[in-house]
Interface confidence: low
């Protein structure tokens, strides 16, 4: 049999070898596709089948607009003028090229020596599903589950049957390397079909804090507290000599004397926000801790609030 690949929505014509120039009863097509239950028989004398397929005068079978449900096996049996039976057998597969893939939520900056999300590559409208692959500086990036992690997701549209692919890349860049260039490509895996490439992204690699990096500890854990409760933030840093520690809320310095501990007693909603501490060390200037989101909630439900918090003041602050 012959393998045929056809693009969804386009016409497909299958020729019937040995078909007589003026067909009589001596030609028939048998189809086993997603539209048929087992085999469907079509003959030149029969009606066109649901506008899906019809036999042309030369015996060829025409499908005016092929779809996913037309994938399957097509067989023609014809008797030539000499009375010899000639069979044609086709295995038909369909494809659809998706739109150009793109990297959504691309990182503009990566921190060396820690896992960072580079971005999510998205391809929409393919058939068959195909594959997404990542490239670093033009070379294929092989996920190893450690320094390079790829999370993939494939969804199929319930009506069109076309696929959406998502591939999230997380990397742990080395320190002191060059600026990496990441790109992603989609491949249908069909012969003579070139991969589709995204525009490249070039996040800069930020050096991590020195070994004596800052840790921000929060009590209660998770940073969610009931109104009237107490929150204790502790800025832990192993540097010697100990640096001055200042406190930041929503990007603004809190006017307090430097201290490694920030105590928020009897908290109210005005105390909610994103807190971090800044250590000023003679050898490498100010270093900021990762942020902690403090939430004041009646029910004590856990969870992170997203986005910026515009501070409009603090309640009582004690050190």
């Amino acid at each position: 049999g012959q393998n045929i690949t056809a693009r969804i929505g386009e016409p497909l014509m299958l020729s019937c070898k040995g078909a007589p120039k003026k067909p009589t009863q001596k030609l028939e097509w048998k189809l086993n596709t997603g539209r048929t239950e087992a085999w469907k028989v079509l003959s030149p004398q029969g009606d066109p089948w649901d506008s899906v397929a019809r036999i042309l005068p030369n015996g060829s079978l025409l499908l005016p607009a092929i779809g996913i449900v037309d994938e399957g096996t097509f067989r023609c049996r014809a008797t030539n003028r000499l009375g010899k039976e000639v069979k044609s057998n086709y295995r038909v597969r369909v494809y659809q090229i998706p739109g150009k893939p793109e990297i959504v939520n691309p990182a503009s900056e990566l921190t060396a020596n820690v896992p960072n999300k580079v971005g999510t590559c998205v391809s929409e409208g393919s058939y068959p599903a195909g594959t997404l692959s990542w490239h670093l500086d033009g070379k294929p990036l092989i996920p190893d589950g450690k320094g390079t992690v790829v999370k993939e997701e494939t969804r199929r549209h319930p009506e069109t049957g076309l696929f959406t692919l998502r591939s999230e890349l997380t990397v742990t860049p080395a320190q002191g390397g060059t600026t990496p260039t990441y790109s992603c490509s989609f491949s249908l895996g069909l012969p003579r079909r070139r991969p589709l490439n995204t525009a490249p992204i070039q996040p800069r690699v930020r050096e991590p804090l020195p070994p004596e990096g800052i840790q921000l500890l929060v009590e209660p854990e998770g940073g969610t507290v009931a109104p009237g409760g107490t929150v204790t933030l502790t800025c832990a840093i192993s540097a010697q000599p100990p640096p001055q520690i200042h406190w930041i809320k929503d990007g603004t310095p809190l006017p307090l004397a430097p201290s490694p501990v920030l105590l928020l007693p009897e908290v109210g909603h005005e105390d909610e926000g994103i807190y971090s501490c800044v250590a000023t060390h003679p050898s490498h200037g100010p270093q900021e801790s990762p942020p902690v989101n403090i939430r004041v909630t009646e029910t004590g439900d856990e969870g992170q609030a997203a986005g910026s918090v515009d501070g409009s003041g603090l309640g009582t602050l004690a050190l």
Epitope: E109, R206, H246, I248, D250, G251, T252, P253, L254, P255, L256, A257, I274, V278, G285, P286, E288, P291, S308, V309, D310, G311, S312, G313, L314, L317
Partner: antibody
Framework: EIQLQQTGPELVKPGASVKISCKAS????????MLWVKQSHGKSLEWIGN????????FYNLKFKGKATLTVDKSSSTAYMQLNSLTSEDSAVYYC??????????WGAGTTVTVSS | QAVVTQESALTTSPGETVTLTCRSS?????????ANWVQEKPDHLFTGLIG???NRSPGVPARFSGSLIGDKAALTITGAQTEDEAIYFC?????????FGGGTKLTVL
């Protein structure tokens, strides 16, 4: 050399909006907070708000909440301030300044905004 | 909102020591107000001099120093020079906002 380069003067109509940019160079943009300040003609300075480029978190003077919106584009090391629903009261020189939490060492040259019909 | 008050103008001579002060309407200025001092020269040229009461900004000459004198923040210029003629603004952090003073016009004759 550390520099904050601000956009040139803007002449805008009442009710319109304007977006001022402040492009940082010569230092790591995400390591410092960006402060925005207003200087009205013949008056002192007024603090508008801060943005932390590393996290994108903002903090506003309540007087300017709703009037000013602060954003950053880390890829181009640029801070932006959009002023909405402009009136003649908003005619002023607007400055960005780099802050490392306890001093504002480097300032932009200022952007003059004139609101006039 | 707090009001921050400065001397409107001061005059000094080259080589002299001059002190500019900054008062808060809410009471004594403390280290918790993180007093800042900013210099404005003609054509809107601003430079940060002092932050956190007494931290000199990088590159600022040693003749500029910040301190607390009594209940006020102070900027002292030891051995003033003609190029120090400018307007000096102080700024104080309060719990949720930053307030600038009206500025002191310093003349060096």
């Amino acid at each position: 050399e550390i520099q904050l380069q601000q956009t040139g003067p803007e002449l805008v109509k009442p009710g319109a909006s304007v977006k001022i940019s402040c492009k940082a160079s010569g230092y790591s943009f995400t390591d410092y907070i960006m402060l925005w300040v207003k200087q009205s003609h013949g008056k002192s300075l007024e603090w508008i708000g801060n943005i932390n480029p590393y996290y994108g978190s903002t903090f506003y003077n309540l007087k300017f909440k709703g009037k000013a919106t602060l954003t950053v584009d880390k890829s181009s090391s640029t801070a932006y301030m959009q002023l909405n629903s402009l009136t003649s009261e908003d005619s002023a020189v607007y400055y960005c300044a780099r802050s490392d939490y306890w001093y504002f060492d480097v300032w932009g040259a200022g952007t003059t905004v004139t609101v006039s019909s | 909102q707090a009001v921050v008050t400065q001397e409107s103008a001061l005059t000094t001579s080259p080589g002299e020591t001059v002190t500019l002060t900054c008062r808060s309407s809410t009471g004594a200025v403390t280290t918790s107000n993180y007093a800042n001092w900013v210099q404005e020269k003609p054509d809107h040229l601003f430079t940060g001099l002092i932050g956190g009461t007494n931290n000199r900004s990088p590159g600022v000459p040693a003749r500029f120093s910040g301190s607390l004198i009594g209940d006020k923040a102070a900027l002292t210029i030891t051995g003033a020079q003609t190029e120090d003629e400018a307007i000096y603004f102080c700024a104080l952090w309060y719990s949720n906002h930053l307030v600038f003073g009206g500025g002191t016009k310093l003349t060096v004759l």
